[in-house]
């Protein structure tokens, strides 16, 4: 906190310029008018102030706007944004995508900070939903953004926004998140033809149910092993050997290398060994020939 002292004669700042770097902290506090600073915020970025001087400028804005900065100031914060705390940002009402972009640009190349997370949260809540333009912007700056949201938050993503999602944006999503995103993607891409549809839906298939995988197996999609390994185990288990063979096409040979990993391992345990043998891959661990398979879950449901 800088002591309140009168501004020395002749030192009152008429504009925000480089001469202010020669002011001591108390002089900045005493001689820079907060309203002037607010109207000339864009100039601060061009002046090589020290951390300590920037702290004084922030303090002046805080005093001028105790309830939170107006968007006209926020848009021009530049480097000063990194000085803001999440508590400061929670007071803001950011509605313009241009403002959001300007502030994300400041943090570009860094991990998502608590400040940025708070800013995004305020912005999305203000808009009511994660629209396509916002999602485009956020995933451009932070490819992992989508996967940082809870399933509840993802439920506010409209299907139309799914067009903005790139495969790398889903790299860190877990099955619960893909369970929410997959139906939206299915809806978004429903009017595409077979091969184009598969290219778009492929990244979301970790949320696909068994019946959709069965349908895909009829379309010569040639799913790669990396995609297959990300499928829900409970969705893969009911697939027959013939369906998996059709689903993977020439990639079926890759099952051998993955036979000890889920979901392949669990799927093998559910198949008849003689069916597995038809693949000619040497997969072992299926149900021996002549054994009867009882579905106990069905039995429990009946009793």
């Amino acid at each position: 906190e800088v002591e309140k002292t009168a501004c020395p004669s002749g030192k009152k700042a008429r504009e925000i310029d480089e001469s202010l770097i020669f002011y001591k902290k108390w002089e900045l506090e005493a001689c820079v008018d907060a309203a002037l600073l607010a109207t000339q915020m864009d100039r601060v970025n061009a002046i090589p102030f020290t951390y300590e001087q920037l702290d004084v400028l922030k303090h002046k804005l805080d005093e001028l706007y105790p309830q939170g900065y107006p968007e006209s100031v926020i848009q021009h914060l530049g480097y000063l944004f990194l000085k803001m705390s999440p508590e400061d940002i929670r007071k803001w009402n950011v509605t313009s995508l241009e403002t959001l972009k300007a502030l994300l640009e400041v943090n570009k190349g860094h991990e998502m900070s608590p400040q940025v997370a708070t800013l995004i949260d305020r912005f999305v809540k203000g808009r009511g939903q994660l629209d396509k333009d916002t999602l485009d912007t956020l995933t451009a700056f932070y490819p992992g953004y989508l996967c940082s949201l809870s399933p509840e938050e993802l439920s506010s993503v409209p299907p139309s926004s799914i067009w903005a999602v790139r495969p790398q944006d889903l790299d860190t999503c877990d099955p619960r998140q893909l369970d929410v995103l997959y139906p939206k993607a299915r809806l978004a891409f429903q009017n595409m033809n077979g091969s184009e549809y598969f290219v778009k839906i492929q990244s979301f298939l970790g949320g696909a149910p068994t019946e959709d995988l069965k349908a895909l197996s009829q379309q010569n999609v040639s799913m790669d092993l990396a995609t297959f390994m990300k499928l829900r185990t409970d969705a893969v288990l009911p697939l027959t050997v013939a369906e998996v063979q059709k689903l993977l096409g020439p990639h079926v040979e890759g099952l051998k290398a993955e036979e000890r990993h889920r979901p392949v391992r669990d799927w093998i345990l559910r198949q008849r060994q003689d069916d597995l043998d038809t693949l000619g891959l040497g997969l072992q661990g299926g149900i021996p020939n002549g054994y009867l398979v009882l579905d106990l879950s069905m039995q429990e449901a009946l009793s």
């Epitope: 480089e18 864009d42 061009a46 002046i47 090589p48 102030f49 020290t50 530049g78 480097y79 640009e105």
Partner: nanobody, 117 residues
Framework: LQLVESGGGLVQPGGSLRLSCAAS????????IGWFRQAPGKEREGVSY????????NYADSVKGRFTISRDNAKNTVYLQMNSLKPEDTGVYSC????????????WGQGTSVTVS
């Protein structure tokens, strides 16, 4: 991406030193530079300023006529020529680079020590 200062040392009153502020990992052309100094137990103070083009310079009253700031964009370096040094010029000198309009990047150096004694 950082600024590295060099050229400090021990010098007698009335002597000269030339400090360098070199950019590592980014191009200094588009950045305005400020030189600051901090004497032991005192607040850091601004010493000199040069605009990104080099066309505008400014100095603290205490160093006017003795210090000269310049830049060589080909060498990605800004210089502070310090003449007629006084004991009160003693301190750690560091540079700050500000990116300007549409560029919020800002870089600080660790500093180089100057002792006039």
């Amino acid at each position: 991406l950082q600024l590295v200062e060099s050229g400090g040392g021990l010098v007698q009153p009335g002597g000269s030193l030339r400090l360098s502020c070199a950019a590592s990992g980014f191009t200094l052309d588009y950045y305005a530079i400020g030189w600051f100094r901090q004497a032991p137990g005192k607040e850091r103070e601004g010493v000199s300023y040069i605009s990104s083009s080099g066309g505008s310079t400014n100095y603290a009253d205490s160093v006017k006529g003795r210090f000269t700031i310049s830049r060589d964009n080909a060498k990605n370096t800004v210089y502070l020529q310090m003449n007629s040094l006084k004991p009160e010029d003693t301190g750690v000198y560091s540079c700050v680079a500000a990116g300007g309009y549409g560029n919020s990047s800002r870089y600080w150096g660790q500093g180089t020590s100057v002792t006039v004694s």
